[in-house]
């Protein structure tokens, strides 16, 4: 049998022809269902991998594995049948049509086969043992699987149940939280009616304090009222008698109505003929806003205007910049006329300023400062003072050159300390200087060693605070 | 430099008076107040009280008042302090001190070193 | 009269140690407060005033706080010749008081 060739029919089967002289015999055989050929992409080792399989896919395999052996047993058994129904199918052919002669060759033929399906079926057994080793390898791999995957569940369930901790606490502190929230809101609404009460008790507070100033300004007015009253009463009585001195006056006996004339000033009031110590009312340097000042009418020649008067102590002098600014106290008492209207009126025309003082001894004396003037506000009222004369000391106890003005709340001074917080009161304070007309007031038998007290230092010294203080200005050329 | 010296240790019997100088140089006398300080052995400083050289103005601590005369020669820029009716607790080291204010007793810059009064019979 | 407690009477502390030491006062005494140094045999020195502010050629190591009430004084790196008693005063009310002093002694 010089030609034995292998090859495929149109159908798919495979064919194995033999030729032998003139005689040829073809064997068909019946092809595997379920069997891969060897260009399929299957790749045995391609389940070997560093990430486990699902595990129902390895499932799948093996279960497409079995039945591939099951195929693969079946097909063995369908060639053992059919070679073997083939064999005497042919040997009955030969039997009857062969010659005698042919038989040797059909021996030999039938040989041939049998050794083919030996052939085949030890590579049929080799098949069936990769199959076994593939397999043992996919239940390896499989048990692997499945111990990963109980690792994973069990994973799982500890992440489960952390996640479940974590829902109960986070449960338990939106409780808390929402406890907190709600007794928050009970709180806010109890402070919130607190605020009310206050604030109701407050407007109340304001009004009566309202209704207080309100009094304290009629009874200030009336006062003044009186005071004006008085006056007048007095200036009536001065005119009824120097109409009477006046023999055989021609003129109406009838008193002329007073022109409203403004007083910048009480050297104007003076001028006019007001020559009685009071309260009067001064106008701003071009301007209609009034202030209310004392005049001394009487002392060196009159005409002063009180910018400061300290005598019982009766006002606290320890007072803002604003106060200060603008005023406070009592023109008929202790009282402070304002730092603005002083300034404004200083920078009109040239002032001299003349310090009052008293002790508890019953001594006095005065300093006399020939050009006086207070710088605006954006220079903080700066002291300007030349010319000293007087008896209240050789030496100005009022720092030279002037010092800027102080306060509680406008430390301007030139100490570390704040002069005014030290010793009380505003001041044109230096480091801290001199003297403290502002300062607090002490009663007699306190008023040594007290360096917080009303001091000017060139009469009295550092501890000594003084009974009274009147400072008061005047036009130079009055 | 600014200097402050004292007069010499004392010792005296109770009931006696001391006097205690303290000569100021290196700065005008007259622009400071000068202060007296006393340490009893183991004891708190004590203030006795000021003088101001420049108007002879005092002050004394209640304490003291009646006992002591604090007193100053500007001529020689030498400020006194006499302490009378000595007891045994008067017994200390006294200081005189310079106030770094002339106008106010503040605090104290510039210290003598010191004099030891000692009061035993 | 206003009293002046110190705290601590005593400290033992090393070169190079932090030391503070405390002064409260019996009323407010706004920043009307010294500190003084004082060595044995030696009158006192004036190191800080108006509570914080050093006086001329004190080191810096040396500092002052507080108003009101109450006062510090800190060493940042005690040096040997830093070993003495310190005191501390106000004079903001008369009289002046002085504190009873502390002392800092070699550790």
């Known amino acids: 049998y010089n030609n034995f060739r292998k090859s495929m029919d149109s159908i798919g089967k495979k064919q194995y022809q033999v030729q032998h002289g003139s005689c040829s015999y073809t064997f068909l055989l019946p092809e595997m269902d379920n069997c891969r050929s060897s260009s399929s992409p299957y790749v045995s080792n391609a389940v070997q991998r560093d990430a486990p399989l699902e595990y129902d896919d390895s499932v799948q395999r093996l279960q497409v594995l079995e039945n591939i052996m099951e195929n693969n047993t079946q097909w063995l058994m369908k060639l053992e049948n059919y070679i073997q129904d083939n064999m005497k199918k042919e040997m009955v052919e030969i039997q009857q049509n062969a010659v005698q002669n042919q038989t040797a060759v059909m021996i030999e033929i039938g040989t041939n086969l049998l050794n083919q399906t030996a052939e085949q079926t030890r590579k049929l057994t080799d098949v069936e043992a990769q199959v076994l080793n593939q397999t043992t390898r996919l239940e390896l791999q499989l048990l692997e699987h499945s111990l990963s995957t109980n690792k994973l569940e069990k994973q799982i369930l500890d992440q489960t149940s952390e996640i479940n901790k974590l829902q109960d606490k986070n449960s338990f502190l939106e409780k808390k939280v929402l406890a907190m929230e709600d007794k928050h809101i009970i709180q806010l609404q109890s402070i919130k009616e607190e605020k009310d009460q206050l604030q109701v008790l407050v407007s109340k507070q304001n009004s009566i304090i309202e209704e207080l100033e309100k009094k304290i300004v009629t009874a200030t007015v009336n006062n003044s009222v009186l005071q004006k009253q008085q006056h007048d009463l007095m200036e009536t009585v001065n005119n009824l008698l120097t109409m009477m001195s006046t023999s055989n006056s021609a003129k109406d006996p009838t008193v002329a109505k007073e022109e409203q004339i403004s007083f910048r000033d009480c050297a104007e009031v003076f001028k006019s003929g007001h020559t009685t110590n009071g309260i009067y009312t001064l106008t701003f340097p071009n301007s209609t806003e009034e202030i209310k000042a004392y005049c001394d009418m009487e002392a060196g020649g009159g005409g002063w205007t009180i910018i400061q008067r300290r005598e019982d102590g009766s006002v606290d002098f320890q007072r803002t910049w604003k106060e200060y600014k603008v005023g406070f106290g009592n023109p008929s008492g202790e009282y402070w006329l304002g730092n603005e209207f002083v300034s404004q009126l200083t920078n009109q025309q040239r002032y001299v300023l003349k310090i009052h003082l008293k002790d508890w001894e019953g001594n006095e004396a005065y300093s006399l400062y020939e050009h006086f003037y207070l710088s605006s506000e954006e220079l903080n009222y700066r002291i300007h003072l030349k010319g000293l004369t007087g008896t209240a000391g050789k030496i100005s106890s009022i720092s030279q050159p002037g010092n800027d003005f102080s306060t509680k709340d406008g430390d301007n001074d030139k100490c570390i300390c704040k002069c005014s917080q030290m010793l009380t009161g505003g001041w044109w304070f230096d480091a801290c200087g001199p003297s403290n007309l502002n300062g607090m007031y002490y009663p007699q038998r306190q008023n040594t060693n007290k360096f917080n007290g009303i001091k000017w230092y060139y009469w009295k010294g550092s501890g000594y605070s003084l009974k009274a203080t009147t400072m008061m200005i005047r036009p130079a050329d009055f | 430099q600014v200097q402050l010296v004292q007069s010499g240790a004392e010792v005296k019997k109770p009931g006696a008076s001391v006097k205690v100088s303290c000569k100021a140089s290196g700065y005008s006398f007259t622009d400071y107040n000068m202060v007296w300080v006393r340490q009893a052995p183991g004891q708190c400083l004590e203030w006795m009280g000021y003088i101001d050289p420049y108007n002879g103005g005092t002050g004394y601590n209640q304490k003291f008042e009646g006992r002591v005369t604090m007193t100053t020669d500007t001529s020689t820029s030498t400020a006194y302090m006499e302490l009378r009716s000595l007891r045994s607790d008067d017994t200390a080291v006294y200081y005189c001190?310079?106030?770094?204010?002339?106008?106010?007793?503040?605090?104290?810059?510039?210290w003598g070193q010191g004099t030891l009064v000692t009061v035993s019979s | 009269d206003i009293q002046m407690t110190q705290s601590p009477s005593s400290v033992s502390a090393s070169v190079g140690d932090r030391v503070t030491i405390t002064c409260k006062a019996s009323?407010?005494?706004?920043?009307?407060v010294a500190w003084y140094q004082q060595k044995p045999g030696k009158a006192p020195k004036l190191l800080i005033y108006w509570a914080s502010t050093r006086d001329t050629g004190v080191p810096s190591r040396f500092s002052g706080s507080g108003s009101g009430t109450d006062f510090t004084l800190t060493i940042s790196s005690l040096q040997p010749e830093d070993f003495a008693t310190y005191y501390c005063h106000q004079y903001s009310s008369y009289p002046p008081t002085f504190g009873c002093g502390t002392k800092v002694e070699i550790k």
């Open positions: 001190a310079r106030t770094r204010d002339r106008y106010d007793v503040w605090y104290f810059d510039v």
């Open positions: 009323q407010d005494v706004y920043i009307a």
